[in-house]
């Protein structure tokens, strides 16, 4: 039994069009394999009509196409501008016409409805607009216009141009009647709905003498597009509902099991709370299009989208909509990595971003999502080293540990820094990640001095305390720039079994600067790590002034100042809009931290893990 | 949300027929699958038989078991969906379910919890 399926019977009417969609396992070879769609003749041969590989035969030439979708092992056969020569039996498959996977299909082409001579079809979906002509002859042209629903036997006025409009079209319909030498009027309905649905007659005049057309209007559902994401990934619903609602609030709605739907989010502001921290409403085009992305996908964000316009930011009957059906996948691509990190205040958090293995090249990024309005997300830093002013000495994004994670590290963590942040690449969007940082109490683990005045061509020591927990971790002490946090080069660290014993002596890893010059000046972070993961770091920020009094100079925490005063952000920094985030090309303009010098190098900076009695000052 | 009602079950003798209606009512079924699905004691329930259709094409999907002898069928202006059952064997006896479900994806399965039919007994006898 073959394991393709589809419909075993498609029937339609003369000069429409039918969609055929093909299931089958997707495997890896299913999916990467020739799929077909062929017709049976007398003789049992299939011949091909349309395949993958971009064969398309005469007789279906402009009128049919065949698309696979590997991700969810469908493939679907669109033809249009059916004839009754096109009944017959045909097969959908994979591989070889006569060999491989199939399924028949039997295509029925009838003649369609009994329309009255001459009648005019209109397709058109629901909620969009509809011009219908209506010829007259001249001697018509004084006369009275109308526009007739036909409803069994019966004919109802819907307008006429006596300024009759029936109480169902109101404010959605206008005849419009052209200056003179123009035999034809036309009647434009807006915002159709389903019940719009039907036969109509133009007339214009009465008697023997009127000018009646009729006019069949088809009005269709959109078709649920099928959106198929991995969980803990991202989707994008693009929605362009065209240029006539372009001024019109604009909203994304999930359809409830009431068949009612709930708005995740519209341009007035509003926004479901279980999308908290992981939705974007971006800004829409001139054309009035948008889209609206969503992080972190979990197994209940299932369902049926509908996205849509209306003055009330939600769903109303005969407004235009476009709809998607997202199954969120469980076997899932993206690794899982914590989606809440806690730090305390003062401390540090190191967050595991994940991206597609396959783009290794691509730019990384983390940005602050706000939810202001329709949420947006500034950058914060990037791959290159654009970091925001304000995070300056403070955050860091490595490429470590690689092959699909990258690093960011914030520290000098203050309650302000609570809240969602995402992980994206210039590369495949879905992988886009959401995490939560939530401030908690505590003390942080490691300790540095909050500040440091280093004097020019004297030693600056600077003790970095641990906690036994870190015993068998790296230590390191770098030079935060831009760019990243350069390691400095590091002494001996004394005796090993010192720190497996955890000896109280032992918890201390001190940087030293020998002598202090003026490219000293800047942020060092004293830092742990496992092999390519990050654990906690401790930022001091080291100001290098002239020399007053001679001798070296030892700063233990005691004499620490405070930490330096934030820098304030001028004004004039642009804010990332959401738009960047469907082309990260565009932060390219972000305000740039100006570099901060060479980074200390050579023998004059080093790190020294020996124990504290060494330096001669005291550890608690 | 769909409310779905069966009708049309009952006891008939192999080689019989049998017509299930299912009454849709809630809102117009015209973006939906439709299905037929069918459960015996103890077993999962099994698909046999959908349709769907946009403007004025239809499509019609069956199981294997039920080619060539169930004709699923549609009446728009009663909202209405048919399962003609013809050739009937002890084997089609099980209770019979209308399903509707948003017409995307595969119309064998994912079919809400929300829009199921109570169910109508179809028993064949030898």
């Known amino acids: 039994k073959s394991p393709v399926f589809g419909p075993q019977e498609v029937s339609s009417v003369e000069g429409n069009s039918v969609s055929i969609k093909c299931y089958y396992p997707p495997t890896s070879v299913n999916r990467h394999t020739r799929k077909y769609w062929c017709r049976k003749g007398a003789s049992g041969r299939c011949i091909t009509l349309v395949s993958s590989e971009g064969y398309v035969s005469s007789n279906y030439a402009g009128r049919a196409n065949l698309t696979n979708f590997p991700e969810n092992g469908t493939f679907v056969v669109n033809i249009a501008q059916l004839s009754r020569d096109d009944s017959g039996h045909y097969k959908c498959g994979l591989g070889i016409n006569s060999r491989g996977l199939s399924f028949d299909v039997s295509l029925e082409v009838s003649q369609g409805p009994e329309l009255p001579n001459g009648t005019e079809v209109y397709t058109v979906d629901v909620g969009r607009t509809v011009t219908i002509k209506c010829p007259f002859k001249t001697e018509n042209a004084p006369k009275t216009k109308a526009l007739y629903k036909k409803i069994g036997q019966t004919s109802v006025l819907v307008i006429d141009s006596r300024n009759y409009v029936n109480p169902n079209y109101k404010d959605r319909i206008r005849l419009r009647i052209p200056g003179t030498g123009q035999l034809i009027f036309t009647v434009v309905i807006d915002r159709l709905r389903l019940s719009d649905h039907g036969l109509y007659l133009c007339q214009a005049g009465d008697g023997s003498n009127r000018d009646e057309k009729n006019a069949d209007l088809q009005v269709l559902e959109p078709e649920p597009e099928l959106v198929y994401e991995d969980l803990r990934g991202s989707v994008t619903f693009h929605c362009a509902l065209g240029l006539e609602v372009a001024n019109v609030a604009k909203f994304l709605c999930r359809v409830n099991s009431r068949e009612t739907c709930d708005v995740v989010i519209n341009t007035l502001g509003k926004r479901d709370s279980a999308f908290e921290g992981r939705i974007l409403l971006n800004p829409q085009d001139k054309d009035g299009s948008f889209s609206v992305v969503i992080t972190g996908l979990r197994k209940e964000d299932e369902g049926r989208y509908l996205c849509g316009a209306h003055s009330d930011g939600q769903l109303q009957e005969g407004w235009p909509i476009q709809a998607w059906q997202l199954f969120v996948n469980e076997e899932s691509t993206i690794p899982r990595s914590p989606t809440v990190v806690k730090g305390v205040a003062g401390g540090s958090v190191a967050v595991l971003c994940p991206y597609n293995p396959k783009e290794s090249q691509s730019l990384k990024y983390w940005c602050l999502w706000e939810g202001a309005q329709n949420g947006r997300c500034p950058l914060l830093v990037e791959s290159q080293g654009l970091v925001q002013e304000q995070y300056e000495g403070r955050l860091s994004l490595l490429q470590e540990p690689g092959n699909g994670t990258f690093t960011v590290i914030l520290n000098q963590l203050t309650t302000q820094d609570a809240g969602f942040y995402w992980c994206l690449t210039n590369g495949d969007t879905r992988w886009r990640t959401t995490v939560e940082i939530k401030i908690i109490e505590g003390e942080p683990n490691l300790k540095v001095p909050g500040n440091v005045t280093a004097v020019l061509g004297e030693t600056l020591n600077i003790p970095c305390h641990f906690p036994c927990k870190f015993s068998s971790y790296e230590k390191y002490w770098c030079k935060w720039s831009n760019t990243g946090c350069q390691t400095l080069p590091s002494q001996d660290e004394g005796p090993s079994e010192a720190f497996v014993n955890c000896d109280e002596n032992s918890r201390l890893v001190s940087l030293t600067l020998n002598p202090v010059t003026r490219a000293d000046e800047g942020w060092y972070w004293c830092g742990v790590k496992q092999g390519h993961f990050y654990g906690e770091t401790a930022a001091v920020y080291v100001a290098v002034e002239e020399k007053k009094v001679a001798g070296s100079r030892y700063v233990s925490p005691a004499k620490a100042d405070a930490a330096p005063d934030e820098k304030v952000l001028d004004s004039g920094v642009r804010e990332i809009e959401n738009k960047a985030i469907q082309d990260p090309r565009l932060f390219a303009e972000e305000k740039v931290v100006a570099d901060t010098g060479d980074q200390a190098g050579g023998s004059r900076a080093s790190v020294d893990s020996s124990s504290s009695e060494e330096q001669g000052g005291s550890s608690k | 949300q769909v409310q779905l009602v069966e009708s049309g079950g009952g006891w008939v003798q192999t080689g019989g027929s049998l017509r299930l209606s299912c009454a849709a009512s809630g809102r117009t079924v015209s973006s939906y699958y439709m299905g037929w699905f069918r459960q015996t004691p103890g077993k999962e329930r099994e698909f046999v038989a959908a349709?769907?259709?946009?403007?004025?094409?239809?499509?019609?999907y069956y199981t294997d078991s039920a080619k060539g002898r169930f004709t699923i069928s549609r009446d728009n202006a009663k909202n209405t969906v048919y399962l003609q059952m013809n050739s009937l064997k002890p084997e089609d006896t099980a209770v019979y379910y209308c399903?509707?479900?948003?017409?995307?994806?595969?119309?064998?399965?994912?079919?809400?919890?929300?829009?199921w039919g109570q169910g109508t007994q179809v028993t064949v006898s030898s």
């Open positions: 349709i769907s259709w946009v403007g004025s094409s239809t499509y019609k």
């Open positions: 399903a509707a479900r948003p017409r995307v994806g595969d119309p064998r399965s994912r079919y809400d919890d929300d829009n």
